[in-house]
Interface confidence: low
């Protein structure tokens, strides 16, 4: 457990006294505070936040708050020419026009500067033609349309149903079909829970609500101008064309009121099954174009965003460690919001606040961690984790050798449920062993720990008794500490019920309707689930920084490598007859796992046994651990995707925010049944098998005795 | 309501300079973005500069580029614009504007619904 020795302190300053200073008051208030006006990246508001949080971090202790700034590519809305979607009759006249704005929530009518719908990064121009309804768009539903139902989408206007992948994906996959323009909409059946009312009224998406969001395909750039270097002052821009993941072709978010009226005329092809249906009162057909009355109407998109680079700022601060300040462990979340950010981002921005405040009381009486521990407000999150990974390149020579671990603080609450944790195999022990010691917030557990609650009502797929924890993927900050550096991370917040409610995300998600009174009043009236989010965050920060030996526990590593391993065998061998005629054995790969779990166990034992009070062996064992995690990266990256580098992680090529396991060997094998030439194919597929063992052997080496 | 009123035009030589002044009174904590418009005898009214209320975003129009420089003082709650180079097409009304909204690539793209001053003459001419 935490060690006190080492950083010459009272035993009063241990993890109990951090988790008992953070106080569910002092959450509520921070998130009042950072939720009264929309704080956009790039605009004056989210500067003046900027400054408010330098400011009172500096207050509570930290040793120094800069605040570090990029100049980067954003996207915004004309405000004197609106952005909508119109049916036109065929003497071109609109005969309806999707809403320009959402409706504001009670109290909010007179506040300025309320971004209204768009999609970000969307390029300028105004097609029109017949729409085709694509379901979500993903990989599998234009595979469907496509090879079974043979719709072509070439030219057309595809409309898609928010939910399941991340919007970026859909917008690729609807520019790979040839599609002409995006219109993407909120489906009740997705955003719209049963037996809840609308907002003001419950946590439901209104029918005026609309999902904002980038649409971009950056693969871990960060800002599409300067991919792999900071957007400095001296930096080199890439012209437009040449930038990095924009769409294509022109995208538009609504609301499922404006939904109903374009897909209430929806003709052609029947849904191919009961998977494409929604909730709406219309019939989902596919399409082409509206059925018979109507087959003279076309749809035409009207937009006029414009990309400007923009200056954002993320806040910096530093509570230096006492023995090893040249390690670190990161707390970092975003500050900027699409509106009012009440949960997206400022739930985890009060959180951050509130273990911030404590730490510094600890350090106000006398204590330090062992190691330093840097807190991040990002900024531009919302646009493609700009601030995080512009800053993440600026440091990265620091960072690949002194980062210890990275702990992720978006929103702290995405349902009032159970807990949902997302990290390396490391902090698996870590998650378990913290958890047991806090206490569960969750009604029917009082006086159980968090780790009984969350176990019951989230168990693990495999090893029973135990709660799941998932990979992670991206579509959050840790992307270029986890995916590019290879810096051990981790993120946790509370969830809904996944079992009971199948909608994707939570309705308000990126909606005006996201206020302080929206967690207020439905999610979290105690704030309790929040404390028990900044409890979790907070005490892994704090073990990370002050344990004597790293709590991380390769061991588990071993556990998931086999799992793996198998997964990824199994998809191949669904081609047994080509793996016969091309050769393809995945030998390499079972033996390296079995040399790191072997490796793996012999590095624990001595773990067990070595002379903690010996600093520089301690030290060396430490590195070890800290660098278990860097030598799973590999230098050239995935294929066509540089800055995702894990070899073990990478987020989907199919959707962002999924985690996939052996990435390069999975796309490697992903419908090659269609591939043109198989030989080639297969021999991509034994190559990625070739990078997965080296690179698997090489990680257990690290592991092995050094001399 | 804010207030504005500009001062510091004139008369002046091709390759001169001047510095033009907004002063901005009444609500100004409400004020996030200022800049410069100007309008020329017979022509629409055209974007000079913007900046923002902390001076991390600036804008200036391609044609005045390298030559005009916009700032400000916000304990004097005033704009500035300093014109170097002068040219004969520089002649026109230059216009303050003030805005409390402020998103995106068209955060200086002001519009009737914004404040405006009365504007100042800057004649250039030999």
């Known amino acids: 457990k935490s060690s006190n020795e080492a950083t010459n302190i009272t035993p009063k300053h241990n993890m109990k006294a951090f988790l008992d200073e953070l106080k569910a008051e002092n959450i509520k208030k921070f998130l009042y505070n950072f939720t009264q006006i929309p704080h956009l990246a790039g605009t004056e508001q989210n500067f003046q936040l900027a400054k408010q949080i330098q400011s009172q971090w500096k207050e509570f202790g930290l040793d120094s708050v800069e605040l570090a700034h990029y100049d980067v590519l954003l996207s915004y809305p004309n405000k004197t020419h609106p952005n909508y979607i119109s049916i036109i009759n065929e003497d071109g006249n609109e005969i309806f026009n999707t809403s320009l704005f959402e409706p504001p929530p009670p109290g909010y009518e007179n506040v300025s500067d309320i971004v209204p719908p768009f999609s970000a990064f969307s390029p300028q121009g105004m097609p029109e033609g017949d729409l085709v309804y694509v379901n979500y768009a993903r990989t599998e539903d234009f595979f469907k349309l496509e090879r079974d139902m043979k719709i072509n989408c070439s030219g057309k206007i595809v409309i898609a149903r928010y939910g399941k992948v991340f919007r970026g994906n859909k917008v690729k996959n609807a520019q790979l079909a040839g599609a002409k323009g995006v219109i993407l909409y909120s489906d009740p059946a997705d955003y719209f829970a049963p037996g809840v009312k609308s907002y003001p009224d419950g946590w439901n998406l209104p029918g005026g609500g609309v999902q904002r969001g980038n649409i971009l395909n950056l693969n871990g750039a960060g800002d599409p101008l300067t991919p792999g270097y900071p957007a400095n002052e001296y930096a080199y821009r890439r012209g437009i064309a040449e930038a990095v993941g924009l769409p294509s072709i022109p995208v538009h978010p609504i609301g499922y009121y404006d939904a109903q009226k374009l897909l209430e005329k929806m003709g052609g092809s029947a849904p191919p099954d009961s998977s494409w249906r929604g909730s709406l009162k219309v019939p989902y057909n596919v399409g082409p174009g509206f059925t018979g009355n109507f087959s003279t109407q076309k749809v035409k998109m009207h937009i006029h965003s414009t990309n400007e680079v923009t200056r954002i700022y993320n806040v910096i601060g530093t509570l230096r460690g006492a023995v090893e300040p040249d390690r670190y462990v990161i707390l970092g979340g975003h500050r900027d919001s699409w509106v009012f950010g009440g949960i997206d981002p400022q739930s985890g921005a009060a959180v951050v606040h509130e273990i911030v405040r404590s730490f510094g009381t600890l350090k106000k009486e006398g204590w330090r961690p062992r190691r330093t521990i840097l807190f991040a407000s990002w900024d531009a999150e919302e646009f493609g984790l700009l601030g995080s990974t512009e800053w993440a390149e600026e440091n990265s020579r620091l960072l690949q050798e002194r980062g210890v671990a990275y702990i992720n603080a978006d929103s702290s609450i995405e349902g009032n449920y159970t807990l949902r944790v997302d990290c390396t195999p490391l902090m698996y022990s870590l998650v378990h062993n913290l958890t047991k010691e806090l206490k569960s917030p969750d009604e029917g557990f009082e006086g159980k720990s968090l780790y009984e609650s969350w176990t019951k009502k989230s168990p693990s797929p495999e090893f029973s008794g135990m709660p799941r924890i998932s990979k992670l993927g991206s579509g959050n900050d840790f992307e270029v500490f986890f995916q590019r550096l290879g810096i051990a991370s981790g993120r946790a917040r509370y969830t809904k019920n996944w079992e009971t409610n199948k909608f994707s995300g939570y309705p308000l998600y990126h909606s005006v309707y996201e206020t302080y009174e929206l967690v207020e009043k439905f999610y979290d009236p105690m704030f309790k689930y929040h404390l028990t989010v900044a409890q979790v965050r907070g005490g892994m920060v704090f073990e990370l920084a002050n344990s004597i030996v790293l709590p991380f526990d390769c061991r588990d590593y071993a556990v998931v490598l086999r799992k793996y391993a198998d997964k990824i065998y199994s998809i191949s061998m669904k081609h047994p007859q080509e793996m016969k005629t091309y050769s393809v054995s995945f030998d390499s790969l079972f033996s390296a796992v079995k040399n790191f779990t072997e490796i793996a166990s012999k590095f624990s034992e001595r773990l067990q046994d070595f002379d903690k009070s010996n600093p520089i062996v301690l030290r060396m064992m430490n590195d070890q651990l800290m660098f278990l995690e860097r030598a799973f990266i590999d230098p050239l990256g995935l294929p066509d995707r540089p800055f995702y580098r894990h070899v073990i992680y990478a987020p989907s090529s199919h959707n962002k925010y999924a985690g996939e396991s052996f990435p390069g060997i999975y796309d490697a094998l992903f419908d090659i049944e269609s591939k043109v030439d198989p030989s080639k194919a297969w021999g991509e597929v034994k190559r990625q098998i070739y990078v997965a063992a080296f690179t698997v052997q090489a990680a257990a080496e690290t592991l092995s005795e050094v001399a | 309501q804010v207030q504005l009123v500009e001062s510091g035009g004139g008369v002046v030589q091709p390759g001169r300079s001047l510095r033009l002044s907004c002063a901005a009174s009444g609500r100004t904590f409400g004020i996030y973005v200022m800049g410069w418009y100007r309008q020329a005898p017979g022509k629409e009214r055209e974007f000079v500069a913007a900046i923002s209320w902390s001076g991390s975003n600036r804008k200036v129009s391609d044609s005045v580029k390298g030559r005009f420089t916009i700032s400000r003082d916000n304990s004097k709650n005033t704009l500035y614009l300093q014109m170097n180079s002068l040219r004969a097409e520089d002649t026109a009304v230059y216009y303050c504007?003030?805005?409390?909204?402020?998103?995106?690539?068209?955060?200086?793209?002001?519009?009737?619904?914004?404040?405006w001053g009365q504007g100042t003459q800057v004649t250039v001419s030999s």
């Open positions: 504007a003030a805005s409390n909204k402020l998103y995106g690539r068209t955060w200086y793209d002001f519009n009737e619904s914004d404040y």
